[in-house]
Amino acid sequence: VQVLNLQARLRVLEMYFLNDTLAAEDSPSFSLLQSAHPGEHLAQGASRLQVLQAQLTWVRVSHEHLLQRVDNFTQNPGMFRIKGEQGAPGLQGHKGAMGMPGAPGPPGPPAEKGAKGAMGRDGATGPSGPQGPPGVKGEAGLQGPQGAPGKQGATGTPGPQGEKGSKGDGGLIGPKGETGTKGEKGDLGLPGSKGDRGMKGDAGVMGPPGAQGSKGDFGRPGPPGLAGFPGAKGDQGQPGLQGVPGPPGAVGHPGAKGEPGSAGSPGRAGLPGSPGSPGATGLKGSKGDTGLQGQQGRKGESGVPGPAGVKGEQGSPGLAGPKGAPGQAGQKGDQGVKGSSGEQGVKGEKGERGENSVSVRIVGSSNRGRAEVYYSGTWGTICDDEWQNSDAIVFCRMLGYSKGRALYKVGAGTGQIWLDNVQCRGTESTLWSCTKNSWGHHDCSHEEDAGVECSV
C-alpha cells in the first residue's frame, strides 16, 4: 500500500515538473506574470526552477528507497499465501509532510483564507489482520457415508489342535467285496485225509466186464489217488469282521467365503447450511464424534486348519459286507507227498466214477512237438480238426508260455484221442474252458494228432 501511495505521489510531482518547465509558455499563469511583471519574471523563474530540481532529486531518492522496500516486500514468502478476504478500509492517511519553503515571492496582498482542499484519495488497503482465535468446536458431523468394505482379513493363525475325537459309531455295513483275484498255484499239498463221498459224476466209459471176485480181505490202503476234479463250491463262509477304520482323511479344503452381511440403513442427512465466506484457516478443531460404523468388510479367509485331533477310539466293527464272488480257482497244486500208511479203515460204499485231474504235455522237445492231455488216468492226443494258433496259445499258456503256434503232422501218438474240434478264442486260461467235443468223442486217427510250438 505504501508503495502505491509513493508511486502516486511521484507521478504528481513529475506532472508538475513537466508542466512548469517544458510547457511554461502555454501556462496562463506564466503569461500573466510575464505581462504583469515582465522585469521580475526571469529572476522568479530561475529560482523556482532550482526548487523544482531539488524536489525532483528528493523524489528520485525517495523512489529508490521505495524500490528497495518493494524488493523486500515482494521477496517476502508471505506474498504467496492464499489471498485473504478484503480488509476493512484503512484509516485516513496522515497529512503529507510540509513542502519545502518556496523562494520568497514578492510580498503580495494578504490572501483570503483558501477553500478547504479536496478530500485525499483513499489510502491503500491495509495489511491483513492477525490470525483469528481458534474456531469453536464444530458440531458433530452428519453420519458418514457407508464405509467401503474392509480389506480381506489376514489369514488366521492355525487353530489349536483338536481334542481327541469321541469314539466313532459302528461302521456301516460294508459294500459287497469284489470278485477275488485268481489264486496262485497252490503249494505242494499235504497228504489229504480220506475224502467224503464224491458227487455223482457223469457215467464213465463202460469198462470191460470183470470176472466177479470173491470178497477180498481188507487190503492195506494204497497211495492216495490223483486229486479229483475240484469239489463243489463250499458254503459261503461266515462274514469276516470289519477291518479297523482307516486313519482320518486329509483335511478338506476351506469352505467358500461367506457372502457379505447386509448393509446397515444410512442415517438421515442433516439439512445443508448455506456456505459462509471462508475465514482465515482456524486451528484444527477437536475431533468430531465418530460417524456410524461403515458396512462390515468381507470375511477374511479361513485360517490354516489346526493339526488333526488325536485319532478317536476305534469304532465298533460294522456289520460284515456280503461275501464277494469267489475268485477263479488257482492252478492245481503239485501232488502231495505220499502219506504214511494209516490203519486200515472200514471199507466204504462204492462211489460213483468221478473224473480225474487233467494236465498237458508236449511230446518231442520241451517247447515243440505233439500236444497231449492227461485224463482219466491216461495220456491222450488232440485231433487237429479245427486246431489253430488260438488253441495252441491256450495250450502253451497252461505250460507257462506266453506264445503258441499250431503245428500239424508232428508224429502220430498212441492210445486215446481225448479231444477233437477244440475251438478256443485264445483268451481262455485252460483248454477245458474252450468249446470242444466231449472227452473221447472224435472221428480222427493218430495221423491227425495236433502239435504246438510254444514260446516265452
Epitope: N367, R368, D384, S402, K403, R405, A406, L407, Y408, K409, V410, G451, E453, S455, V456
Partner: antibody, heavy 120, light 107 residues
C-alpha cells in the same frame, strides 16, 4: 533226401498268366505244409503263399492276394502256383519250400527255383 | 507287417574268425525265428529254427540266441564253406517276413 523240382517259369507279358509246378519226392508229401517263396534278381527273399497238408488252409502275401492261387494234388505229389495278371515286379526266381510240419512252419527244404520274367 | 532288420548288411572276415550277425524285429515275436544260409545261384538252406534249435545236419559251430525282438546268429569259427548270405525270418504271424540279408565275405 527230400527233392523239390520247380517248373513252368519263363517269359510272359504284363497282364499274362503262368502256372508253376513243384514236383515232390522222397518224403510223404501229403504230411507237410508247402510254400512258395520268391527272390527278385539281386534282392532278398519274399514269402508269398502257404497251403496246409490237407489243403484246408491257404495263406497269401498282400502283394499277390487275388492274383495268385496255391493248390496241391497229394495223389500226384505236386504243388502248384497259378499266377494271373502278372506285373513287371513279379519278375523273380520262384522257389517251392517244404514246411517242417503239416501247416505253417519253418522252411526246411527248398527246390532249385524257376525264373519268371514279366516283360513286354 | 513285422519288419525284420539285419546288421551289418555285409561283413568281411577270415577263416577261423568268430562272427556275429544280428536281427531285430519291429515287434516281439517270442522265439519264432529262423536263420537261413544262401550261396550264389543256390536255394536257401535252413540252419536254425525256434530261435536256437539247430536243424539236423547243420554243423555245431552255428548257434542262435535271443527272444522277443533281438536275435543273434553266431559262427564260432568260420570255415571256407560258410562264406554266403544269411537271412533271418519271423514265423510269428502272417505274412512271414525275411531280413534284407547279411553278406559274409572273405577278408
Amino acid at each position: 533226401e527230400v527233392q523239390l523240382v520247380e517248373s513252368g517259369g519263363g517269359l510272359v507279358q504284363p497282364g499274362g498268366s503262368l502256372r508253376l509246378s513243384c514236383a515232390a519226392s522222397k518224403f510223404t508229401f501229403s504230411n507237410y505244409g508247402m510254400n512258395w517263396i520268391r527272390q527278385a534278381p539281386g534282392k532278398g527273399l519274399e514269402w508269398i503263399a502257404l497251403i496246409y497238408y490237407n489243403s484246408n488252409n491257404k495263406y497269401y502275401a498282400d502283394s499277390v492276394k487275388g492274383r495268385f492261387t496255391i493248390s496241391r494234388d497229394n495223389s500226384k505229389n505236386t504243388l502248384y502256383l497259378q499266377m494271373n495278371s502278372l506285373r513287371a515286379e513279379d519278375t523273380a526266381v520262384y522257389y517251392c519250400a517244404k514246411s517242417l510240419t503239416g501247416g505253417s512252419d519253418y522252411f526246411d527244404s527248398w527246390g532249385q527255383g524257376t525264373l519268371v520274367t514279366v516283360s513286354s | 507287417d513285422i519288419q525284420m532288420t539285419q546288421s551289418p548288411s555285409s561283413l568281411s572276415a577270415s577263416v577261423g574268425d568268430r562272427v556275429t550277425i544280428t536281427c531285430r524285429a519291429s515287434k516281439s515275436i517270442g522265439t519264432f525265428l529262423a536263420w537261413y544260409q544262401q550261396k550264389p545261384g543256390k536255394a536257401p538252406k535252413l540252419l536254425i529254427y525256434s530261435g536256437s534249435t539247430l536243424e539236423s545236419g547243420v554243423p555245431s559251430r552255428f548257434s542262435g540266441s535271443g527272444s522277443g525282438t533281438d536275435f543273434t546268429l553266431t559262427i564260432s569259427s568260420l570255415q571256407p564253406e560258410d562264406f554266403a548270405t544269411y537271412y533271418c525270418q519271423q514265423h510269428d504271424e502272417y505274412p512271414f517276413t525275411f531280413g534284407q540279408g547279411t553278406k559274409l565275405e572273405i577278408k
